[in-house]
């Protein structure tokens, strides 16, 4: 039961995380105009990965897409790439993890296959989360650098009375959404990897030996039984000589050669 819960929770957490990564990538408020210590402007600027927007105090908002690819800063392109890779990996991870879920039965898929799929999706979620965190962090670093550069040049060209106030940008909501979403995806991935350990079937390195007793023909398999997938013919998976009926999770909690650290 604990394995199913861990796997299910990992899936849900990753799902929320990836939804957050998608939301952050699409959001326009990656950087917002810094209003602190600035003259109060009747215009508010904010920028995303795909377009920049201006909201006037009158209530009108105008957004313009970045219709150039080569003219954009390399760092912005890198952030875009990281976020897209994160989304793609996360989406594939979600797809894989759906089929790996213990509560979903597909054909005669064995637990070993489900364990492998759970591990695969977990790794994908971890990489996806890291991509998102890296992307957001790179953008944040870019903002901090530009912020202090523009602060140093805050009042440029003060030829006489005329002052040109440079617009400074600070962290937008999308950065926080991205960090949280990346973290959730990462946590979800770790949970999937942990769940994989419990899903792995128990095996031993030696073959089953048949003992032929007079009068009875009973085959004992010292390694216990393979964890049931819950499908078709292999429904009678309890050891008849076992003192009490044990749940699958309890049986699988013993160490096996499929344990992942």
């Amino acid at each position: 039961m604990a394995v199913t819960a861990c796997q299910g929770l990992g899936f849900v957490v990753s799902l929320i995380g990836i939804a957050g990564i998608i939301a952050a990538t699409c959001m326009d408020q990656w950087s917002t105009q810094d209003l602190y210590n600035n003259p109060v402007t009747a215009v508010f600027n904010y920028q995303g990965l795909w377009r920049s927007c201006v909201r006037e105090s009158s209530g009108f908002t105008e957004c313009r897409g970045y219709f150039t690819l080569l003219g954009l800063p390399a760092m912005l392109q890198a952030v875009r790439a990281l976020m897209i890779v994160g989304i793609v990996l996360g989406a594939i991870g979600l797809l894989v993890s759906i089929f790996a879920l213990k509560c979903i039965r597909i054909g005669s898929m064995e637990d070993s296959a489900k364990a492998n799929m759970t591990l695969t999706s977990g790794i994908m979620f971890i990489v996806s989360g890291l991509c998102a965190i890296a992307g957001v962090s790179v953008f944040a670093n870019m903002l901090v650098t530009n912020f202090w550069m523009s602060t140093a040049n805050m009042y440029t060209g003060m030829g006489g009375m005329v002052q040109t106030v440079q617009t400074r940008y600070t962290f937008g909501a999308a950065l926080f959404v991205g960090w949280v979403a990346g973290g959730l995806t990462l946590i979800g991935g770790v949970m999937m990897c942990i769940a994989c350990r419990g899903l792995a079937p128990e095996e031993t390195n030696y073959k089953a030996v048949s003992y032929h007793a007079s009068g009875h023909s009973v085959a004992y398999k010292p390694g216990g039984f393979k964890a049931s997938t819950g499908f078709g013919s292999n429904t009678k998976n309890k050891k008849i000589y076992d003192g009490g009926a044990r749940t699958e999770d309890e049986v699988q909690s013993y160490p096996s050669k499929h344990d992942y650290v």
Partner: antibody, heavy 118, light 113 residues
Framework: EVQLVESGGGLVKPGGSLRLSCAAS????????MSWVRQAPGKGLEGVAT????????YYPDSVKGRFTISRDNAKNSLYLQMNSLRAEDTAVYYC???????????WGQGTLVTVSS | DIVMTQSPDSLAVSLGERATINCKSS????????????LTWYQQKPGQPPKLLIY???TRESGVPDRFSGSGSGTDFTLTISSLQAEDFAVYYC?????????FGGGTKVEIK
């Protein structure tokens, strides 16, 4: 058709108070930033107060800060200007105006005259 | 507060002639986000409220004749009336629409020569 109608002007003694109202119609009032602009007799225009569409922000020039308060009632499509501690130099025609593209004042009322005199 | 300085104070022009009004702001009105200048021009006739002519320094309000044009960027702006008509004799104001409080220029009176 956009309409802005000011009311509440009149004669008031120095140090007195007055509340101007502006009834708006023909546009989405709650989504529009609004301003009060005044014009002293024979003089130029002076922005007196601005209120943002969400009612979150209000702005005043130093000449009226602390004395004038702009407010709005979106349910009644009305804009208000509460004027306290009035001075002789506050004598002017007060216009109510809507902010449009570029924060420009695209629609104006006909104005209401406020006279501060003893 | 941003200071808006208009010149000249008054201008005597003959019908059909070109009129040019200048406006200078104490700070740049150019917004880097959309590369637009937040300067507005108004026309006011006696006994009437001002009428919006041009916003974003060069965008004509709908219904405004094309003889009115705005230009300039940053701190220096110009309103040009290419061929003055009788109905154009009025007072013209420029306005800072970028910094609060939104401030007006002193006005330029265009009179018949």
């Amino acid at each position: 058709e956009v309409q802005l109608v000011e009311s509440g002007g009149g004669l008031v003694k120095p140090g007195g108070s007055l509340r101007l109202s502006c009834a708006a119609s023909g546009f989405s009032f709650s989504n529009s930033a609004m301003s009060w602009v005044r014009q002293a007799p024979g003089k130029g225009l002076e922005g007196v107060a601005t209120i943002s569409s969400g009612d979150s922000y209000t702005y005043y020039p130093d000449s009226v800060k602390g004395r004038f308060t702009i407010s709005r009632d979106n349910a009644k499509n009305s804009l208000y200007l509460q004027m306290n501690s009035l001075r002789a130099e506050d004598t002017a025609v007060y216009y109510c105006a809507r902010q449009g593209y570029g924060n420009a004042l695209d629609y104006w009322g006909q104005g209401t005259l406020v006279t501060v005199s003893s | 507060d941003i200071v808006m300085t208009q010149s000249p104070d008054s201008l005597a022009v003959s019908l059909g002639e070109r009129a040019t009004i200048n406006c200078k702001s104490s700070q740049s009105l150019l917004n880097s986000g959309n590369q637009k200048n937040y300067l507005t021009w108004y026309q006011q006739k006696p006994g009437q409220p001002p009428k919006l002519l041009i916003y974003w320094s060069s965008t004509r309000e709908s219904g405004v004749p094309d003889r009115f044009s705005g230009s300039g960027s940053g701190t220096d702006f110009t309103l040009t009336i290419s061929s003055l008509q009788a109905e154009d004799f009025a007072v013209y104001y420029c306005q800072n629409d970028y910094y609060y409080p939104l401030t007006f220029g002193g006005g330029t009176k265009v009179e018949i020569k």
